[in-house]
Amino acid sequence: AQNITARIGEPLVLKCKGAPKKPPQRLEWKLNTGRTEAWKVLSPQGGGPWDSVARVLPNGSLFLPAVGIQDEGIFRCQAMNRNGKETKSNYRVRVYQIPGKPEIVDSASELTAGVPNKVGTCVSEGSYPAGTLSWHLDGKPLVPNEKGVSVKEQTRRHPETGLFTLQSELMVTPARGGDPRPTFSCSFSPGLPRHRALRTAPIQPRVWEPVPLEEVQLVVEPEGGAVAPGGTVTLTCEVPAQPSPQIHWMKDGVPLPLPPSPVLILPEIGPQDQGTYSCVATHSSHGPQESRAVSISIIEPGEEGPTAGSVGGSGLGTLA
């Protein structure tokens, strides 16, 4: 069978080889398509309800005024010329529709390095057959499930037209110290060959480098956190990030009811002040980061100062 590719909504003419150019003609067209269950026979003198879909022209060709999805299938013509010689024509018709240019919607203006981020959703509407969407980074194809790349795809079919809408959501984990302005684009590749891909306009989100967790430093004076009763302990939370984050304090895993401050002073230490302290830095652009914990303990007279004391009460300190 000869393969024919036709665009949905366009007319199509299939020639009946060997047919006399004018009536009277002895010919018959047989269709096996989405509109038929077995073979439907159309003849030159046929004229009827099928004419809106397919009709035999005076020259014996079959005319489809506007090809639809249901016209995919096999078309056969059997013709006899004036001398009684029989000729058969056999066509396999496939249809296609090119969608509108794909678009990236819900695109991110900023990505955070080292964590998964949604870049955007690529949408293509009105294709047939469905086709595929693929993502590109700086012009090179992105492979899902490789190097922190993941793609969520969805295909929907319009209940009336039968055309497809494709959606593809891209998630990436940018490498620390990588390109600060990567270029992402998405392209639609048609399901039928010989049609070029359609590409979206590119997007260029900024990549923001967060302050690593280990950079929240907790400095304690005196060093080691062991102090004589009535002494003073100063805890300082150092975060080099700009702008300066809000610093909150924790004791024994419970937030202290104090206003934010980078310095916590524990004057006139008593048994109630003993415990494990840490600070939590909260950045406006991402989640909280906690420092290492330090243990504050009281040295009784005559004891050697330990580097870490035992956990104690629940006294409150003052802020610098």
Epitope: G47, G48, P49, S52, V53
Partner: antibody
């Protein structure tokens, strides 16, 4: 909302002529085939004529061929049936309906107009 | 020409009954059959299109089925407003042919 309104029916003598009209609204008229169907008093439904969306092709049963002519004016969203050489057996309610091809069959119908052929 | 033989020509039934009406085509018409309901003095109303599909706004108690050239309209539970005349139509070939009709009356 799809609406089809027939007019032009009435009493006519055998051998006479009558022209029926159907005003269509609520849909893109030139996208659809259109059809006339009739129903004699107390009888069933009978197909009378169909026309394709462009108006280039018309279709009739043998019972009315060469006497009736279906036509359309897509600019006016109107369908017509010119009936000549009328006979007593043409007495019926004439309905205008949307469709007539395999894509639609017949979906929406007008309320009908009565044609009486009698001397 | 294709004949559409509709049976029964009339039937009596009660509210709540299951009603079945059949049309047999004299040759293959594929899926190209519609079913209509007509009440006295009114235009026909399409119930089923392409043999098995329920038209918009038609209650789900109506259904259509097909086996070869036999087409069936079923009303699963007859309601007072369903007493009417029902017609099938083949639209695969010209002349378009209607069945003779089935009058559904109150028992």
């Amino acid at each position: 909302e799809v609406q089809l309104v027939e007019s032009g029916g009435g009493l006519v003598q055998p051998g006479g002529s009558l022209r029926l009209s159907c005003a269509a609204s609520g849909f893109t008229f030139n996208n659809y085939w259109m059809t006339w169907v009739r129903q004699a008093p107390g009888k069933g439904l009978e197909w009378v004529a169909s026309i394709d969306n462009s108006g280039d092709n018309t279709y009739y049963p043998d019972s009315v061929k060469d006497r009736f002519t279906i036509s359309r004016d897509n600019a006016k969203n109107s369908l017509y049936l010119q009936m000549n050489s009328l006979r007593a057996e043409d007495t019926a309610v004439y309905y205008c309906a949307r469709g007539g091809d395999i894509l639609v069959g017949l979906d929406y119908w007008g309320q009908g107009t009565l044609v009486t052929v009698s001397s | 020409d294709i004949q559409m033989t509709q049976s029964p020509s009339s039937l009596s039934a009660s509210v709540g009954d299951r009603v079945t009406i059949t049309c047999r085509a004299s040759q293959d018409v594929g899926i190209y059959v519609n079913w209509f309901q007509q009440k006295p003095g009114k235009a026909p109303r399409r119930l089923i299109y392409r043999a098995t599909n329920l038209a918009d706004g038609v209650p789900s108690r109506f259904s259509g089925s097909r086996s070869g050239t036999d087409f069936t309209l079923t009303i699963s539970s007859l309601q007072p407003e369903d007493f009417a005349t029902y017609y099938c139509l083949e639209f695969d070939e010209h002349p378009l042919t209607f069945g003779g009709g089935t009058k559904v009356e109150i028992k």
